[in-house]
Each structure stands twice: as structure tokens, then as C-alpha cells.
């Protein structure tokens, strides 16, 4: 590359025959040598030319030569078939020198005035070559004043000869299991003065196979083996080649995972080169035989190193390795020709023995103990005392290995206790407290814990009671001794239950009236439902139609009797509901503060007195019969009343349960 222009001294001038513009003399010989700077040539043209014409300009002539080459021999005035006169032609030196020779012979038949010529040095455009001549540069030629330089396309580098472009074709590494490689520019002629190295490097265990494809044309020699251009193939085992000529070499099975291909070219020749398609092989793994009820994917004729297959089981079958389940299975062929994992089994899905249903049973429908795919089981609840909650109880063993209901549920059905069952089918007449018989009040709960109180069983693990009855134990739930399934207060034969937690209505304020006098006790275990232990129902929305004024409810408990002692046997009384305004008015005179009776309360009893609940009955249920469902429900909770139970003109006051259904449902669902 030039280091910046160095302008040469200008070269130009005039030449003329001796005596010009007069006639030239005989026997004259004159020689001019013109020299231009390197990279420049000389341009010459004639402004006047008048020499004796002779055959082939033998007599008088002007001869132009550049180096050893004669550019022109000129004579006459006009050109003929055999002689040339310059006319308007311009003459150029071949290099930077031009020799001009003028000669006249011994005689002229008439006078001739000779010649006048002008010359000047001009830049040679080395990049322009005559047709058929080799180009100055392999790729790009750049002319400049006094010289030129060559450059190469991307991927080539200029050889030290400053003209040839050698290919940058070393260091290519092929790692795919198959591919193609070729001489640079294939199928166009490959570059000169190049040394190319290609590497195929596959994982250990693969063997490279080389196939020469399409055409092969590498400069050769008739006697010597590939002296000019050649292709060599080297593996860790042996060398193949050199290859040249026009014949496609045979397939080469290298038995190696690494191959080096070397291609060397010299400065001459015009050949199209070569193309190789390579593939690879490896020791095949045993053909995978799908397990029963499974299939292999993908299916191939053979499986070699790095090839893999997966096993897919039919619906209702699962992948197992022994007892251990697999979500998917893929094995890969290793270099030693073995699979990296053993074949799993496709075993029929087994949902296993179904879970026991609390308060229910399960029946095998498909067959005794059959728990495999598509097997059917039927859950049912213990009749009379339990009913299945929104579920038909039919479960199928599905492909995911879970027992699944017709609604797609995987959880067990729920056996809910039947509520409101009683040996009493109707309310009795209004008369004094009666002894309860077995099964009359199976929801009745006896609460001992400092004082005697009562409650009513809800579902199979909750007790509904009055807030004031359990207020002292709200932070020590385990102190509550809860008994059920007995009529006799002091009997040793009862079902024991213990409290897990006590929930007192947030609106209840102890020692400040009895508004919101309601509480729930969560039992730490479910109780077994039977004819003597059955929950009470919560009121339906329509329940108020069975709780109008004068409708009869039943209160039960072991509270104080008319004799002033706690009852030994469970007692009950049938009492009518009292008009709310009447009840409110009854408790507005001293000693009761105004507003004692709220909208969250209902009153029951006789105006004449004598029939009432009393201390010790607190928290017990005031129940009513829903004549539509024929089930008993809790309408009230024994809360408070006159200082003297059963006093005339006073009434028992009960927490109105229907007002608390959302509160009850929220607590039960949350806990």
C-alpha cells in the first residue's frame, strides 16, 4: 500500500526530424530514448509526418520500440496495405521507456519534410488488461498514480506476492453428525496459493464416512503424484491421499470420530475442486422392544450413539420401574452400544384399595378387590343416621391412578349425619315437665365445667350452646366436660367428648345483657351417630312459618325443677312461642333494664307460668318440628328469664337461632 503520493518531475517534450520543418538530409540516423518514472508510461503522437514511402519502410522510417518490442515502423504519409503512417494514432510505451529511431537512406527521389512528434508521461492503469491476458490481481485491483495495489474479498488474504488471494480456509470444525464441505468457491475454480484445513470432530463412539460427490477436479501431473495441488485426509489411524486429477475418489470409512482434511494449492491452474458429503455411524444399540401395552417412539431401522427412544403406555397403563412410577421414559444409546436405562414396564394403573369412608362403607362393583383401571366402587353411608352429601358415591379408577367420582372429584364423599331425628314425632300437649325417653332428644348435650349447662349437637363435631354458659371456659376449651347419649345426668354410661375450641359470638358482652347469647364448641373428634346421639337441624329459611306466635316448641334439660334441684333424668317441656311485643313489655318493668329483649331473642312460655326452662338448662335447644321435612330443628337457645323460673306473666327468653345462620355456617366452614 503506497505511503502517500510522491509526485515525479513532469516528463514531456517534442521530437522532430533533423532540419524540421525543412527537408531532412540523406544518410541520417537519430535515436531518442525517453524514460518515464516507474508506474508511468509514455504517450507519443505525431503532428507532422512526411517520409519517403518504401516497401515495408526499408528506406526511410521512424521506428518506435519499447524494450525489446517494436511498437511500429512508420514511413510515407498515408498508410498502405504493407506500410504504416502514424496519421492520428497515439502510441504508448509498454513500460516506462520508449525508444524512437529516425533513419533516412542514401537518396530521396523528392524532398520530404520529416516529422514532428510530442510526448508526455502518463499513469499506467495496471488494472486494465487486454482480453486474454491474466488479470493483474486475483480479486480487486486498485490503480493510483504511479502504481496499483491488490485487495481480496472477505475470507481471503493477500499472498506475499501482493497479487494472489489465498483462501482463509483453516480451522473450520464440523461437529454435526453429517454435513458437507468443499474446496473454496466450489464449483467455481478454487483459489491459488492456499492451504486449507478442515476438521470433522464428532463425539467418541462415532465413525466418520466420507463420500466425494458431484465432481472432482484438482490440478495433476501425468508423471508425478499430485505435485501442484492436492487433497489429503488424516485420521488418528491412517492417512488417505494425496488426491488430485479428475476422478472421484472412493468412499472412505475412517473408523474414527476425528478427521482432518488438508487441501493445498499452488500459484497456477484453473480447476473446480471437490465436494465431500460426510455421514457418521456408530455401534448400534439393541433394538428396543416395547413392553406389553406400550409403544416405542420414534421407530427407526436402527439406533446408534446419541439416538434415543421414548416409551408411551396405552391409556390406563403407567410407566413403572419396579414399584416406582415414572411420568416419562427416554433411553439414550451410548457409545458402547448399550442403552443408558433399562426398559420400564407398562403396568395397568392400580388405584389401590379405596380409602375408608367415615360413617360409611365401600363396595367393589367390578369384582372383589379389583382396583385397576376402569374398576368401579360404590361408597354408601350408614343408613338411617348418615346421608351422602352431593355425591352419588360411584367412583371409577381413572388413568391418573385416582378414584374419581362422576363429577370428577378425587376426594372422598362425605357422610353427613342425618339431623333432627327423634323418637317423638309430634309435640305434646302443654302440661308439666315430662321425663324424656330414650331417643326423644338425641341432640341433647350435657356440659360440665364449673356449672351445669346444656347444648345441642350440630353435625357430628360441633355443639351449639349459649355464650354465657361457656364464657368462663373460652380460653380453656379443654376444661369442658361434654357428655351425650345419656338421659341420666349422673349416669356413668355416656359418650364422652372433649372440646377443641370455643367460639363465642363477637357481639356478646358478658354481664351486660344477653344479646347475641350464642356460642359454638368444636369437638376434638367426631362422635358416632346413633339413635341416642343425633344432631339437631339448623332452621331452613322457611322455618319461621313453624315458629309463629303460639306455635309449640320443646325445651329439654337437666336444669332446676319445681323442687329446686337439678333434674336427675332429662326433662322436657312443650311451650308456646309468645308474641314478641308482649314479651318485650313483660321485661320492661323493674327490675329489668329497658331493652332487655332484643330482635335476636324469642320468648316462650305460658302467661300463667309453671312451664319454663331454668338454671342448668342454659345453652339447651328449644326445638320445633318442621312438618314438611319431618325433622326437628333448633329455633332457640335457652338464654335467660325471670329470677323465678315459671313465674306468671314472665317468659323464658331464647336466642333466636335463625338470625345467626350465616355466623354458624362461617365458623363451621372456616374451622
Amino acid at each position: 500500500t503506497p505511503l502517500g503520493p510522491k509526485w515525479p518531475e513532469p516528463v514531456f517534450g517534442r521530437l522532430a526530424s533533423p532540419g524540421f520543418p525543412g527537408e531532412y538530409a540523406n544518410d541520417q540516423e537519430r535515436r531518442w530514448t525517453l524514460t518515464a518514472p516507474p508506474g508511468y508510461r509514455l504517450r507519443l503522437y505525431f503532428t507532422h509526418f512526411d517520409l519517403e514511402l518504401s516497401h515495408l519502410c526499408e528506406y526511410d522510417f521512424v521506428k518506435l520500440s519499447s524494450g525489446a518490442k517494436v511498437l511500429a515502423t512508420l514511413c510515407g504519409q498515408e498508410s498502405t496495405d504493407t506500410e504504416r503512417a502514424p496519421g492520428k494514432d497515439t502510441f504508448y510505451s509498454l513500460g516506462s521507456s520508449l525508444d524512437i529511431t529516425f533513419r533516412s537512406d542514401y537518396s530521396n527521389e523528392k524532398p520530404f519534410t520529416g516529422f514532428e512528434a510530442f510526448y508526455a508521461a502518463e499513469d499506467i492503469d495496471e488494472c486494465q488488461v487486454a482480453p486474454g491476458e491474466a488479470p493483474t490481481c486475483d480479486h480487486h485491483c486498485h490503480n493510483h498514480l504511479g502504481g496499483f495495489y491488490c485487495s481480496c474479498r472477505a475470507g481471503y488474504v493477500l499472498h506475499r506476492n501482493k497479487r494472489t488471494c489465498s483462501a482463509l480456509c483453516s480451522g473450520q470444525v464440523f461437529t454435526q453428525r453429517s454435513g458437507e464441505l468443499s474446496s473454496p468457491e466450489y464449483p467455481r475454480p478454487y483459489p491459488k496459493l492456499s492451504s486449507c484445513t478442515y476438521s470433522i470432530s464428532l463425539e467418541e463412539g462415532f465413525s466418520v464416512i466420507l463420500d466425494f460427490v458431484e465432481s472432482f477436479d484438482v490440478e495433476t501431473h501425468p508423471e508425478t503424484l499430485c505435485p501442484y495441488d492436492f487433497l489429503k485426509i488424516q485420521t488418528d489411524r491412517e492417512e488417505h491421499g494425496p488426491f488430485c486429477g479428475k476422478t472421484l475418489p472412493h468412499r472412505i470409512e475412517t473408523k474414527s470420530n476425528t478427521v482432518t482434511i488438508t487441501f493445498v494449492t499452488d500459484e497456477s491452474g484453473d480447476h473446480t475442486g471437490w465436494k465431500i458429503h460426510y455421514t457418521s455411524t456408530a455401534q448400534p444399540c439393541p433394538y428396543p422392544m416395547a413392553p406389553p401395552n406400550g409403544h416405542v417412539s420414534p421407530v427407526q431401522a436402527k439406533y446408534i450413539l446419541k439416538d434415543s427412544f421414548s416409551i408411551f403406555c396405552e391409556t390406563g397403563y403407567e410407566l413403572l420401574q419396579g414399584h416406582l412410577p415414572l411420568k416419562s421414559f427416554t433411553a439414550v444409546c451410548q457409545k458402547d452400544g448399550s442403552w443408558d436405562r433399562p426398559m420400564p414396564a407398562c403396568s395397568i394403573v392400580d388405584c389401590g384399595p379405596p380409602d375408608d369412608l367415615p360413617s360409611g362403607r365401600v363396595e367393589y362393583i367390578t369384582g372383589p378387590g379389583v382396583t385397576t383401571y376402569k374398576a368401579v366402587i360404590q361408597y354408601s353411608c350408614e343408613e338411617t343416621f348418615y346421608t351422602m352429601k352431593v355425591n352419588d358415591g360411584k367412583y371409577v379408577c381413572e388413568a391418573d391412578g385416582f378414584w374419581t367420582s362422576s363429577k370428577g372429584e378425587k376426594s372422598l364423599p362425605v357422610c353427613e349425619p342425618v339431623c333432627g331425628l327423634s323418637a317423638r314425632t309430634t309435640g305434646g300437649q302443654i302440661y308439666g315437665g315430662q321425663k324424656a325417653k330414650p331417643g326423644d332428644f338425641p341432640w341433647q348435650v350435657l356440659i360440665l365445667g364449673g356449672t351445669t349447662a346444656a347444648g345441642a349437637l350440630l353435625y357430628d363435631n360441633w355443639v351449639l350452646t349459649a355464650a354465657h354458659a361457656v364464657y368462663e371456659q373460652k380460653h380453656d376449651a379443654s376444661a369442658l366436660d361434654i357428655r351425650m347419649g345419656t338421659l341420666k345426668r349422673l349416669s356413668p354410661h355416656y359418650t364422652q367428648a372433649w372440646s377443641e375450641a370455643v367460639f363465642i359470638h363477637e357481639g356478646y358482652t358478658h354481664d351486660a345483657g344477653f344479646d347475641n347469647d350464642i356460642a359454638l364448641i368444636k369437638l376434638n373428634n367426631k362422635v358416632v351417630i346413633n339413635s341416642n346421639i343425633t344432631p339437631i337441624c339448623l332452621p331452613r329459611k322457611e322455618a319461621e312459618s313453624f315458629m309463629r306466635t303460639d306455635d309449640i316448641g320443646t325445651a329439654s334439660g337437666w336444669g332446676l325443677t319445681q323442687r329446686g334441684f337439678l333434674a336427675r333424668n332429662l326433662m322436657y317441656v312443650d311451650i308456646p312461642i309468645v308474641d314478641h311485643q308482649k314479651c318485650t313489655a313483660a321485661y320492661e318493668k323493674p327490675p329489668y333494664p329497658r331493652g332487655s329483649v332484643t330482635a335476636n331473642m324469642l320468648c316462650a312460655g305460658l302467661e300463667s307460668g309453671g312451664k319454663d326452662s331454668c338454671r342448668g338448662d342454659s345453652g339447651g335447644a328449644l326445638v320445633f318440628l318442621d312438618s314438611e321435612t319431618e325433622r326437628w330443628f333448633v329455633g332457640g337457645i335457652v338464654s335467660w328469664g325471670s329470677m323465678n323460673c315459671g313465674e306468671a306473666g314472665q317468659y323464658g327468653v331464647y336466642t333466636k337461632v335463625i338470625n345467626y345462620i350465616p355466623w354458624i355456617e362461617n365458623i363451621i366452614s372456616d374451622f
Partner: antibody
């Protein structure tokens, strides 16, 4: 890198419930495999307790079936062991592991004592 | 349940020597057997699964063989770090069971 880590109380009273959690990192417990609980009483051999599979199905050692529950929390990539009504015989190093034991937790010693 | 019986209970071997550990199943378990190495105070380390498949990262000196009821773990040339207790484990059926272990100690 798949890692399993057991956590839970090192001391449990007799008749109470032993609760342990295995936290898995580097692999989702729903992606594949069975996820086991295995224990090793002092100086004794390993005992497989049960597994929960990628799909949430469980399999228990029949000798423990009435007392054992294995569950999982996929949002936390954890699976848990509950063993009820424990006695001194349940004192052991408890391990969680994947499938046929390619990865194990470091183990946690649980002592049953009043 | 399937009982896995390992023998010998203790094996005394010099470094560089070959160790052969045996495990017998009380009934056919196919090839559903794994081998573990356990060092004091550490959790077991998996060596072999499916009777003969070596886990990646496990040195080639460890190899497993057998099927049905008889299984072998071979350590071709014992290194100092190989002295430990080795357990076999069947996962063919519920309950999965383990052998009592073979202690490989320095002779």
C-alpha cells in the same frame, strides 16, 4: 443441581405426631419420579416409609399405613411426612430421597421422648 | 415383604484389591435393585441402579450385576475413599426394602 433438605422438630413426645418437610430445589416434584421418605434407626438398617409420586399418588409401607400420611405443596416444591402416635421405636434419622435414591437429603435426627 | 440379605456383614480388604459384595433377595425382584454407599454421619450415596447401571459421576471401578434373586457389587480396585458401608435395595414391590449392609474395612 437437584437438592433435598429435610426440616422439622428434632424432639417429639410419645403419642404425638411427627411432622417433617422435604424442600426440593433444582427439580420440580411434579415433573417426574417418586419422592420417598426413608428412615434409619440408630445402628439399624434403612426402612422405606412411603412415597408421593409426581402425580400426587401415595404408596406406604404396610407396617406404617395406619399412622403415615405423605402430602405435598407444589407451590413450595415440598413434600411432607406425618407419622402419628409415635413411640420410642420411631427414633431415627429421617431422610427424603428421589426415586431409587439418586438424590438424598442430609437427614434429620428425630428423637421420640417425653 | 421381600427380605434382602447381604453377605458378608464385614469385608476386610487391602487398598488396591478387589471387593465382591453379595445381596440375595427372598423372591424374584427382576433387576430392580440399587446399591448405596454410606459413610458415618452421611446420607447414602447412590452407586448403581437397575442392578448394573452406574450413575454418572460414579467411578468405573464400581460395577453391579445379577438379576432375579442374586446380586453382586464389585469394586475392582479399592481406594482409600471406598471404605464404607454398602447397602442393597429392592424397589420391585411394596414395601421397598434394604439389606442390612456390608461394612468394607481396611485390612
Amino acid at each position: 443441581q437437584v437438592q433435598l433438605q429435610e426440616s422439622g422438630p428434632g424432639l417429639v413426645k410419645p403419642s404425638e405426631t411427627l411432622s417433617l418437610t422435604c424442600t426440593v430445589s433444582g427439580y420440580s416434584i411434579t415433573s417426574d419420579y417418586a419422592w420417598n421418605w426413608i428412615r434409619q434407626p440408630p445402628g439399624k438398617k434403612l426402612e422405606w416409609m412411603g412415597y408421593i409420586s409426581y402425580s400426587g399418588r401415595t404408596s406406604y409401607n404396610p407396617s406404617l399405613k395406619s399412622r403415615i400420611t405423605i402430602s405435598r405443596d407444589t407451590s413450595k416444591n415440598q413434600f411432607s411426612l406425618k407419622l402419628s402416635s409415635v413411640t420410642a421405636a420411631d427414633t431415627a434419622v429421617y431422610y427424603c430421597s428421589r426415586h431409587y435414591g439418586d438424590y438424598w437429603g442430609q437427614g434429620t435426627l428425630v428423637t421420640v421422648s417425653s | 415383604e421381600i427380605v434382602m440379605t447381604q453377605s458378608p456383614a464385614t469385608l476386610s480388604v487391602s487398598p488396591g484389591e478387589r471387593a465382591t459384595l453379595s445381596c440375595k433377595a427372598s423372591q424374584n425382584v427382576g433387576t430392580n435393585v440399587a446399591w448405596y454407599q454410606q459413610k458415618p454421619g452421611q446420607s447414602p450415596r447412590a452407586l448403581i441402579y437397575s442392578a448394573s447401571y452406574r450413575y454418572s459421576g460414579i467411578p468405573a471401578r464400581f460395577s453391579g450385576s445379577g438379576s432375579g434373586t442374586e446380586f453382586t457389587l464389585t469394586i475392582s480396585s479399592l481406594q482409600s475413599e471406598d471404605f464404607a458401608v454398602y447397602f442393597c435395595h429392592q424397589y420391585n414391590e411394596n414395601p421397598l426394602t434394604f439389606g442390612g449392609g456390608t461394612k468394607v474395612e481396611i485390612k
